[in-house]
């Protein structure tokens, strides 16, 4: 996961820009990425990197814990 | 209307250090990121660095190695830049300006004179 | 960082004629199809005042003889017809990346 959202977020050089992805990354079990990103005030490329980082993240968590439940984990 | 409102002129010793305001209104001001500029006498525009209010998140030029501190006071909707060990090199004006979207300088103050002078 | 140069440094312009400012940037400022180049006016004692975003949008209030454009790495700041009250500096700036930076400046002198 982290591998993954450290090449996401290198691409951006604006340093905001890329903490938006990162805040995009933390757990929130409550409300979707949408749902989150609906809440940013601060400007488009900040909605785009959160959802982006918010979705990649999602998804790998999901695939994650599919993977242990076949394990038996 | 946005207004971003800076403190007045300041005349300070070398190796001293200097605080600037900027006083916005007329927004949110934990939506928008302050960014602050200097500009020699005669010379172009140089930038320092920024805050983003809302989360305290702060980048700086590498040029000012150290010496610039831009903090903010989001119950005053003020922000400021501390600027250390003074040299006379450092004599010009100081802005702050607001960016919007993460793209471009909107609104500006309306800069305040440093002059470092022994 | 990205370095932004700009030509001429000065130009003096008769009333009526075409006033025309480049910036190259040593790298380009497009991320996602998006040019992140500004350009800004100054005026003697006053900040700058922001002319165009986006390499080509005008912003509120600004009269209609301003245009910008150009991608990635060339960017032009047009102003036709030159007026008198046009005398000041240009400054290109560029958002795509910290830090931000300016170009050097041009000066326009009417003629």
């Known amino acids: 996961l982290q591998e993954k959202i450290e090449e996401i977020a290198a691409k951006y050089k604006h340093l905001v820009v890329k903490k938006c992805c990162y805040d995009g990354v933390r757990i929130n079990h409550d409300e979707t990425c949408e749902q989150r990103a609906a809440r940013i005030s601060v400007g488009p490329r900040c909605v785009k990197a959160f959802t982006e980082c918010c979705v990649v993240a999602s998804q790998l968590r999901a695939n994650n814990s599919h993977k242990d439940l076949q394990l038996g984990r | 209307q946005v207004q971003l409102v800076q403190s007045g002129a300041e005349v300070k010793k070398p190796g001293s250090s200097v605080k600037v305001s900027c006083k916005a209104s007329?927004?949110?001001?934990?939506?928008?990121?302050i960014h602050w500029m200097r500009q020699a006498p005669g010379q172009g525009l140089e930038w320092m660095g920024y805050i983003y209010p809302r989360e305290g998140w702060t980048n700086y030029n590498e040029n000012f190695k150290g010496r610039v501190t831009i903090t903010a006071d989001k119950s005053t909707s003020t922000a400021y830049m501390e600027l250390s060990s003074l040299r006379s090199e450092d004599t010009a004006v100081y802005y702050c300006?607001?960016?919007?979207?993460?793209?471009?300088?909107?609104?500006w103050g309306q800069g305040t004179t440093v002059t470092v002078s022994s | 960082d990205i370095v932004l140069t700009q030509s001429p440094a000065s130009l003096a312009v008769s009333p009526g004629q075409r006033a025309t400012i480049t910036c190259k940037a040593s790298?380009?400022?497009?991320?996602?199809?998006?040019?992140?180049m500004n350009w800004y006016q100054q005026k003697p004692g006053q900040p700058p005042k922001l002319l165009i975003y986006a390499a080509s949008n005008l912003d509120s209030g600004v009269p209609a003889r301003f245009s910008g454009s150009g991608s990635g790495t060339d960017f032009t700041l047009t102003i036709n017809p030159v007026e008198a009250e046009d005398t000041a500096n240009y400054y290109c700036?560029?958002?795509?990346?910290?830090?931000?930076?300016f170009g050097g400046g041009t000066k326009v002198e009417i003629k």
């Open positions: 300006a607001r960016e919007r979207n993460l793209e471009y300088f909107d609104y």
């Open positions: 790298q380009s400022v497009d991320f996602e199809g998006f040019n992140y």
């Open positions: 700036q560029q958002s795509v990346e910290d830090p931000h930076t």
């Open positions: 007329g927004y949110t001001f934990t939506d928008h990121i």
